[in-house]
């Protein structure tokens, strides 16, 4: 039940990569805006995005204040210029969205080498720490703070000149791994967070090969 | 659930081929890498290779790189081991294993090739 | 390759004993050392990964220690299911490779 020609929201979807998170959902607003809240399972309701013919809501400024929290959000439908009306029960119509715990749940986005350093039949491989809007001390985390041993790194490693891959692990942001003088190699790196059992892996890096510019040689 | 279900051993020729699969169900292999073993009677466990099914990579070791092949079928939930040029000492039970990246959680039943004319 | 050397390769050991076997790599694995039992005509079962974590499930007697090149799996006190085949694997680069097995068999 609900106000004449509001209907509620369906298809509430969390959309979060490295903790940057918006709720999205449907239908697209005929005659009515929609305002979102979020809570904690034990906190009050906060509001957002208040009114709005979006169909989308930033709501990462909430979920980093404790990553490890689960959230669950709802979204009011309302009459475009009617906001005070209500359904029937009294209350205005909403849905709710699934529960959502980003430490659990977010994407990991897709990593990048930073750099690459060759020192004789040594290359060591150096991915970049994303910085997240996860905040401590009015400073920014990267992810490997967030997520400290919990995540890791995989590198794909190759010769140019041939298809045969090899592996290895990190759980810091570097890889140091033996290769043939003489040759290049390329590299792509995945993240993981093996504790997981959804979202438990990034899409790969993009190929970055020695002879270009992020590397560099010492004999 | 978690299942994973080897198929496709037998008695192979020497010179042969063989195609094996490893149906999973409980979880979608997406998620994870998917691993083959063998292990010959009455000798220790040998890996094979691995294969990321989102991403297609694959990596083997050395000594498989040039008869084996690691694929992977994601609507099928099913990954794949083929060898060629199969010979006597390619004999063993075959097995696929779930790997989270920290640990193989899961493996299969296993399935024996008996390479042989 | 990284090659694991694993010792003893078989030993006699009677309920209640405590049980040590040793895995040495041939350079740093940095823990990425995984242990497993076997049982005849049955798939391998993780006992501990990362060298040093209890893999769900395992009773705590299981445990394990070690870091760079030398791990252990220690059973403290031999059960009567415990008589198996236990393998260390490392996973930190591939090939992925194993030790050459340690078989417990009932004195």
């Known amino acids: 039940s609900g106000t004449t020609n509001t209907v509620a929201a369906y298809n509430l979807t969390w959309k979060s990569t490295n903790f940057k998170t918006i709720l999205e959902w449907e239908p697209k607003p005929v005659n009515q805006v929609y305002t979102v809240q979020i809570s904690t399972k034990s906190g009050d309701w906060k509001s957002k995005c208040f009114y709005t013919t979006d169909t989308e809501c930033d709501l990462t400024d909430e979920i980093v204040k404790d990553v490890k929290q689960t959230y669950l959000a709802r979204v009011f439908s309302y009459p475009a210029g009617n906001v005070e009306s209500t359904g029937s029960a009294g209350e205005p119509l909403y849905e709710n969205s699934p529960e959502f715990t980003p430490y659990l749940e977010t994407n990991l986005g897709q990593p990048t080498i930073q750099s690459f350093e060759q020192v004789g039949t040594k290359v060591n491989v150096t991915v970049e720490d994303e910085r997240t809007l996860v905040r401590r001390n009015n400073t920014f985390l990267s992810l490997r703070d967030v997520f400290g041993k919990d995540l890791i790194y995989t590198l794909y490693y190759w010769k140019s000149s041939s298809s045969g891959k090899k592996t290895a692990k990190t759980n810091t942001n570097e890889f140091l791994i033996d290769v043939d003088k003489g040759e290049n190699y390329c590299f792509s790196v995945q993240a993981v967070i093996p504790s997981r059992t959804v979202n438990r892996k990034s899409t790969d890096s993009p190929v970055e090969c020695m002879g270009q510019e992020k590397g560099e040689f010492r004999e | 659930e978690v299942q994973l279900v080897e198929s496709g051993g037998g008695l192979v020729q020497p010179g042969g081929s063989l195609r094996l699969s490893c149906a999973a169900s409980g979880f979608n292999i997406k998620e994870y890498y998917m691993h083959w073993w063998r292990q010959a009677p009455g000798k220790g466990l040998e890996w094979v290779g691995l294969?990321?099914?989102?991403?297609?990579?694959?990596i083997y070791d050395p000594k498989f790189q040039d008869r084996a092949t690691i694929s992977a079928d994601n609507s099928k939930n099913t990954a794949y081991l083929q060898m060629n040029s199969l010979r006597a000492e390619d004999t063993a039970v075959y097995y696929c294993?779930?790997?989270?990246?920290?640990?193989?959680?899961?493996h299969g039943q296993g399935t024996l090739v008996t390479v042989s004319s | 390759d990284i090659q694991m050397t694993q010792s003893p390769s078989s030993l006699s050991a009677s309920v209640g004993d405590r049980v040590t076997i040793t895995c040495r790599a041939s350079r740093d694995i940095k823990s990425y050392l995984n242990w497993y039992q076997q049982k005849p005509g049955k798939a391998p079962k993780v006992l501990i990964y990362?060298?040093?974590s209890l893999a769900e499930g395992v009773p705590s007697r299981f445990s394990g220690s070690g870091s760079g090149t030398d791990y252990t799996l220690t059973i403290s006190s031999l059960q009567p299911e415990d008589f198996a085949t236990y393998y260390c694997l490392q996973h930190g680069e591939s090939p992925w490779t194993l030790g050459q097995g340690t078989k417990v068999e009932i004195k």
């Open positions: 990362y060298a040093t």
């Open positions: 294993a779930r790997d989270t990246a920290a640990y193989f959680d899961y």
């Open positions: 294969i990321d099914p989102e991403q297609g990579n694959t």
